[in-house]
């Protein structure tokens, strides 16, 4: 999304990002689209500190994040590198179980009830979190 100077109403500011926590449930693609329409993206988790922040706000409910492997390798929706980045999968996950017969495995990642990640069928009606970055220019100290 475009950079902002302050968070929109009903969004939560944390570490120079703004977060919006859904209450209803949507399929991953619908949640992804919702965030894009808000000039944001599904949450990208880049640190343990950010993981704890998000986990605190979503509670013990399955919640989509901006991570998927619908085109092959796992990718974050904002382009953050998956291989070198933060990960918090449940043991044995992601298993990309192909038995569900949807043609491409379990292609979307979500926070589980204990906060760790799982891959699941993207059509499941889970909650989601949108994220947008604050104006990076505002982080610079003013010129004297």
């Amino acid at each position: 999304g475009s950079e902002r100077a302050c968070c929109p109403v009903n969004w939560v500011e944390h570490e120079r990002s703004c977060y919006w926590f859904s209450r209803s449930g949507k399929a991953w693609a619908d949640a992804d689209n919702y965030c894009r329409l808000e000039d944001a993206h599904l949450v990208v988790v880049t640190s343990w500190e950010e993981q704890k922040f998000v986990q605190h706000h979503i509670g013990p409910v399955n919640t989509w994040m901006g991570l998927h492997d619908q085109n092959g390798p796992w990718k974050w929706v904002d382009g953050t590198d998956y291989e070198t980045g933060f990960k918090n999968w449940r043991p044995e996950q992601p298993d990309d179980w192909y038995g569900h017969g949807l043609g491409g495995g379990e292609d979307c990642a979500h926070f589980t009830d204990d906060g760790r990640w799982n891959d699941d069928v993207c059509q499941r009606p889970y909650r989601w979190v949108c994220e947008t970055e604050l104006d990076k220019a505002s982080q610079e100290p003013p010129l004297l």
């Epitope: 449930g25 038995g99 569900h100 949807l102 043609g103 379990e106 699941d120 059509q123 499941r124 009606p125």
Partner: antibody, heavy 120, light 107 residues
């Protein structure tokens, strides 16, 4: 033991309203999603609506959307179904059922049902 | 909406028979499928969830299998109390949808 008891059914004229209740006991009501499912005489089961554990998410079958409203009062351990603009095709036994989780995990426990008859 | 097709719609069997009921969905649903048993004048009873997981208290003569679009409920040895109507249901997404039911009758 886990129990769901529906009430509020009866005979009502087309176009009128009715409110069904489902009293829950034997489990922590506020941590489970709840559903309404109906069964017309001699027919199969039809899902009607779901409400998540905290009331935050509600979904309806197309056949009742805009006419029925699902709600819950966690302080009273009670689920409701407000039925407006009733039609003859709404005649059915209405069951409340507990979700296995917060609202997207399938049904496990069912009530005994309450009968709604829409007739002039 | 996801359509559920159950077959057969009815079957006649004898006590001790092995009975198989199938459920096919119009699109893949993973393993988000449940099976229910209903006797005349009674509420449905949950038998299995996640296609193959037995609900607490349900005897092991009931088993389920399948994933994607094709699912099976098997009763290994039919007993008098098993004569009832059986329904499959998908809960991958809303609206939840049921199969039309399979009535298991005494031969």
């Amino acid at each position: 033991q886990v129990q769901l008891v529906e009430s509020g059914g009866g005979v009502v004229q087309p176009g009128r309203s009715l409110r069904l209740s489902c009293a829950a006991s034997g489990f922590t009501f506020s941590t489970y999603g709840m559903h309404w499912v109906r069964q017309a005489p001699g027919k199969g089961l039809e899902w009607v609506a779901v409400i998540w554990y905290d009331g935050s998410n509600k979904n309806y079958a197309d056949s009742v959307k805009g006419r029925f409203t699902i709600s819950r009062d966690n302080s009273k351990n009670t689920l409701y179904l407000q039925m407006n603009s009733l039609r003859a095709e709404d005649t059915a036994v209405y069951y409340c059922a507990r979700d296995q989780g917060v609202g997207y995990d399938g049904l496990d426990v069912w009530g005994q049902g309450t009968t709604v008859t829409v007739s002039s | 909406d996801i359509q559920m097709t159950q077959s057969p719609s009815s079957l006649s069997a004898s006590v001790g028979d092995r009975v198989t009921i199938t459920c096919r969905t119009s699109q893949g649903i993973g393993n988000y499928l449940a099976w229910f048993q209903q006797k005349p004048g009674k509420a449905p009873k949950s038998l299995l969830y996640k296609a193959s997981s037995l609900q607490s208290g349900v005897p092991s003569k009931f088993s389920g299998s399948g994933s994607g679009t094709d699912f099976t409920l098997t009763i290994s040895s039919l007993q008098p109390e098993d004569f009832a109507t059986y329904y499959c249901q998908q809960y991958m997404t809303y609206p939840l949808t049921f199969g039309g039911g399979t009535k298991v009758e005494i031969k």
